[in-house]
């Protein structure tokens, strides 16, 4: 079956996360919960099944420094992932289109 338009993947996913989370930064995977030993990452959640803004926001880093696990910096990138200069991210119109698509 063809993937629904609500899926996000590749650079579009990274850009949309950057837009949604802003200065907070974000994680590509959340720590596994006590209930589930397996950590499901943003790619599994958004590339291969439908994804919404609420779900994306759960991958944002916690705003307050005191609440964040300081041992793991925000925007945790996988091995061999290109490090993007922050200045390259500002494509507001593109992100706006992606987030509007997710709101529908």
């Amino acid at each position: 079956a063809y993937r629904p338009s609500e899926t996000l993947c590749g650079g579009e996913l990274v850009d949309t996360l950057q837009f949604v989370c802003g200065d907070r930064g974000f994680y590509f995977s959340r720590p596994a919960s006590r209930v589930s030993r397996r950590s499901r990452g943003i790619v599994e959640e958004c590339c291969f099944r439908s994804c919404d803004l609420a779900l994306l926001e759960t991958y944002c880093a916690t705003p307050a420094k005191s609440e964040r696990d300081v041992s793991t910096p925000p925007t945790v990138l996988p091995d061999n992932f290109p490090r993007y200069p922050v200045g390259k991210f500002f494509q507001y119109d593109t992100w706006k289109q992606s987030t509007q698509r997710l709101r529908r």
């Epitope: 990274v14 590509f28 992932f81």
Partner: antibody
Framework: EVQLLESGGGLVQPGGSLRLSCAAS????????MDWVRQAPGKGLEWVSV????????IYADSVKGRFTISRDNSKNTLYLQMNSLRAEDTAMYYC?????????????WGQGTMVTVSS | DIQMTQSPSSLSASVGDRVTITCRAS??????LNWYQQRPGKAPRILIY???TLQSGVPSRFSGSGSGTDFTLTISSVQPEDFATYYC?????????FGGGTKVEIK
């Protein structure tokens, strides 16, 4: 040394099947998503499919959807491409490639390719 | 799908020449644009990723620039081993797509 080695190509009749393999070495295979990219003789590059690091997610080009299946065995460090209902237009050199494509990254390691010829 | 258009499709250059190849995306892709070199009978190899980042081990005579829809690969002083075909590729969204290629030949 980081290396990808494809095998399984050959001559097959239209409508036939073939299974390609890609053996990975020199890196932690289970941490990377993997892709297949093909190149018809004298033509450009065409992305075929990607599989997530765990093997739980896949995406295909429209041209192969429903006919090709990408899979992996992380315990064997091997990537596969099962090709069914082959057509003449599937004739190409098939490359496996490592990349961070699901995160917007590039193909940083390529295999040497395996040739698939579909002809009667 | 995002279409990638490369130009020129081929060009002739002499050793030492400055060569510029352009790539245009059918819609904005931020800087998610990669460049590959392919020599005859060989697999492609990555040169530049995210528009301007030089892959480790690639000579500094290669450079990339651009953002949005328009991108450029420049070889500041072409060397004999640079005569090959070059492809751009977007990694902004799936399906991933490549440009048609630019063949750089010896004049």
């Amino acid at each position: 040394e980081v290396q990808l080695l494809e095998s399984g190509g050959g001559l097959v009749q239209p409508g036939g099947s073939l299974r390609l393999s890609c053996a990975a070495s020199g890196f932690t295979f289970s941490k990377y998503e993997m892709d297949w990219v093909r190149q018809a003789p004298g033509k450009g590059l065409e992305w075929v499919s990607v599989i997530s690091s765990s093997g739980g997610g896949t995406i295909y080009a429209d041209s192969v959807k429903g006919r090709f299946t990408i899979s992996r065995d992380n315990s064997k460090n091997t990537l596969y491409l099962q090709m069914n209902s082959l057509r003449a237009e599937d004739t190409a050199m098939y490359y496996c490639a490592r990349g961070r494509t699901l995160y917007g990254g590039a193909f940083d390691i390529w295999g040497q390719g395996t040739m698939v010829t579909v002809s009667s | 799908d995002i279409q990638m258009t490369q130009s020129p499709s081929s060009l002739s250059a002499s050793v030492g020449d400055r060569v510029t190849i352009t790539c245009r995306a059918s819609q904005p892709i931020n800087t998610y644009l990669n460049w590959y070199q392919q020599r005859p009978g060989k697999a492609p190899r990555i040169l530049i990723y995210t528009s301007s980042t030089l892959q480790s081990g690639v000579p500094s005579r290669f450079s990339g620039s651009g953002s949005g829809t328009d991108f450029t690969l420049t070889i500041s002083s072409v060397q004999p081993e640079d005569f090959a075909t070059y492809y751009c590729q977007q990694s902004y969204s799936f399906p991933l797509t490549f440009g048609g290629g630019t063949k750089v030949e010896i004049k």
